[in-house]
Amino acid sequence: PAQVAFTPYAPEPGSTCRLREYYDQTAQMCCSKCSPGQHAKAFCTKTSDTVCDSCEDSTYTQLWNWVPECLSCGSRCSSDQVETQACTREQNRICTCRPGWYCALSKQEGCRLCAPLRKCRPGFGVARPGTETSDVVCKPCAPGTFSNTTSSTDICRPHQICNVVAIPGNASMDAVCTSTSPTRSMAPGAVHLPQPVSTRSQHTQPTPEPSTAPSTSFLLPMGPSPPAEGSTGD
């Protein structure tokens, strides 16, 4: 039967190190990786294996690795965010946007920057609702419909149908009837769209229309990605 090699060991030509091992280019040996929540305190040599140590507070490693230092957890979630995953030795903190906000600048996991969902002003209704990663799209109310609210969820509603019209409706106001029994083509009352649903898909940010409430542009410098923790092999 084949001998089981204990780390560190010299790999055979054309072979790779085993699962949870890496090839140390200095030692020229296959050596043990450190488990999630740990990092390499000392790299292996020809005669001694990798020495692993636990990540310090506010740092983590998520994968089997041989990084000399654990990665720093992201900064605390801002007031427009909620912490959906806490920082532990094995995982980074994940911040997501609170209800009524969407992610304007995402990162590998969670959101870097949240922005408030656009509110459609009177005369405009929601054409496409906001999601976790895309803003609301507004559209002008078509003839026969109106919206008299500033809202990120209200769509254009049909005017009530009057026997006798006192004041005709327009895009931002319902018709006013003189008769006592107006009818509608839809059930009365405001129609609300559901709050943003959870989605991982990325949507193209629509260009703000002159008809919408003012929206702030957000810009942040993009820092370098954290070092890869995966091993490579033949």
Epitope: P8, Y9, A10, P11, P13, T16, Y23, Q25, T26, Q28, M29, K46, T47, T232, G233, D234
Partner: antibody, heavy 115, light 111 residues
Framework: QIQLVQSGPELKKPGETVKISCKAS????????MSWVKQAPGKGLKWMGW????????TYADDFKGRFAFSLETSASTAYLQINNLKNEDTATYFC????????WGQGTLVTVSA | DIVLTQSPASLAVSLGQRATISCRAS??????????MHWYQQKAGQSFKLLIY???NLESGIPARFSGSGSRTDFTLTINPVEADDVATYYC?????????FGGGTKLEIK
Amino acid sequence: QIQLVQSGPELKKPGETVKISCKASGYTFTTFGMSWVKQAPGKGLKWMGWINTYSGVPTYADDFKGRFAFSLETSASTAYLQINNLKNEDTATYFCARRSNFAYWGQGTLVTVSA
Amino acid sequence: DIVLTQSPASLAVSLGQRATISCRASESVDSSGNSFMHWYQQKAGQSFKLLIYRASNLESGIPARFSGSGSRTDFTLTINPVEADDVATYYCQQSNEDPWTFGGGTKLEIK
């Protein structure tokens, strides 16, 4: 199979610079370091040092500190040796060799330095 | 640095006979149960071919006429029987510690 293909011969004047390439194939380039070895006419083999292909950090043997530089183009699986301010004694064949305790070698690049 | 002394510098052997090349290290090249000594063949105007790695392991595709032995400081490359195609210079190399060092080479000729 594992192959290291080096650039062609170079004829240079003293004081000039030469850059030799070594393109690797048949394995994951960033797994194994790349060493450089000098073979001067009528002389023995001298290990010049190596470059870590994962981190990009070079290590130079004592006799090759200063005018010599190792570099990488990882996306092209290629290692480079640059020699600045060439001298007559740099005339030699230079080999790249995969650093996996034993070595797989390139075919060599002859550099001739002559006025 | 580990100094490798190779002997003889040249060797003339009849076809079908045994050729033995020695390599002595100034200090042990053993670590973790391995001897980090390797043997290469260089034919005239060509590059190096790995024959034996870690003292006694035959590289894939190399004929079994080539064998290696030894540990710590004393190593031997044996070619038996020698063929005409074996005319070349043979080098030992250690990789137990940096800098890698090489023997001075042994030139094998046919008698």
